[in-house]
């Protein structure tokens, strides 16, 4: 699942890991876009170990993973990959 | 406001099941990221983590336990439990109740339980 | 499994008093360290979480910090109510473990 959120909320990561996941190992995908009290965008990654990390945005491997999810949905999928919630 | 109680019998012999009973308010089990889990501390010493149920039913044990405990829950009832058998004396301790869930920052064991102290006695 | 050594296991100290209780990893935990306040006859309530940061509504004389695989938790100026059993845990990898805790009493 890849989201992302539009929220109100300050910045949810208070560090960030630029370590490889392989997508097997990936459960779900949140990104939360820069603004709206954040001055950074910021990427949560669940893990199916039931961990959560975030991941640092200007690292390559989640640059491509995004890529791909973005490809795939968006030639797989009548909707849109990008689910906005506004609270 | 989230509160998680503990129940159990407060004594029992060596070689029984212990089986206790976690009942929580304020939140669910059954969002994405939700997840129940038991600790113990036996008198004046540390702590100790012995196993985690997830929302999607995903278990995790301590290993050092693991062919002992067997943890569930009542996802309707807002319950979860903790089976502990053939207790022996190293087993009295309290054991606490607690929360965790996965959101950013993730604080596993945000809340916790008031405990309920077990004691293990011939 | 990941060891957490915590040390003391026990101190003393005054109203005032600068304190700090550390913890250390035996593998790599990359800041998932939780330090615990229990008070006497209390369950555990978060402290500090990801090593550094202030759980809310926890007093500014609390700091956590890190140098390599060392965590510390300091209180700069002690106050009555900071007197009880302080406890890491790392939540790196399964099984999380605790440290063996810390007991903080007035001289």
């Known amino acids: 699942v890849l989201e992302v959120y539009y929220t109100s909320l300050r910045c949810r990561c208070v560090q960030e890991s630029s370590v490889f996941i392989p997508r097997r190992f990936i459960d779900r995908i949140q990104i939360l876009p820069r603004g709206n009290g954040c001055p950074r965008k910021e990427i949560i990654v669940w893990k199916k170990n039931k961990s959560i990390v975030c991941v640092d945005p200007q690292a390559e491997w989640i640059q491509r993973m995004m890529e791909v999810l973005r490809k795939r949905s968006s030639s797989t999928l009548p909707v849109p990959v990008f689910k906005r919630k506004i609270p | 406001q989230v509160t998680l109680k503990e129940s159990g019998p407060e004594i029992l012999q060596p070689s029984q099941t212990l089986s206790l009973t976690c009942t929580f308010s304020g939140f669910s089990l059954s969002p994405y990221g939700m997840g129940v889990g038991w600790i113990r501390q036996p008198s004046g010493k540390g702590l100790e983590w012995l196993a985690n149920?997830?929302?999607?039913?995903?278990?995790y044990y301590n290993p050092s336990l693991i062919n002992r405990l067997t943890i569930s829950k009542d996802t309707s009832n807002n319950q979860a439990f903790l089976k502990i058998t053939n207790v022996d004396t190293t087993d009295s301790a309290t054991y606490y109740c607690?929360?965790?869930?996965?959101?950013?920052?993730?604080?596993?064991?945000?809340?916790w339980g008031q405990g309920v102290m077990v004691t293990v006695s011939s | 499994d990941i060891q957490m050594t915590q040390s003391p296991s026990s101190m003393s100290a005054s109203l005032g008093d600068r304190v700090t209780i550390t913890c250390q990893a035996s593998q790599d935990i990359e800041n998932d360290l939780i330090w615990f306040q229990q008070k006497p006859g209390k369950s555990p309530r978060p402290l500090i979480y990801?090593?550094?940061n202030l759980a809310n509504g926890v007093p500014s004389r609390f700091s956590g910090r890190r140098s390599e695989s060392n965590y510390s938790l300091t209180i700069s100026s002690l106050e009555s109510e900071d007197m009880a059993d302080y406890h890491c845990l790392q939540f790196k990898q399964y099984p999380y473990t605790f440290g063996a805790g810390t007991k903080l009493e007035l001289k």
């Open positions: 149920i997830w929302w999607d039913d995903d278990k």
């Open positions: 990801y090593a550094t």
């Open positions: 607690v929360r965790s869930e996965l959101v950013m920052p993730y604080v596993p064991f945000d809340y």
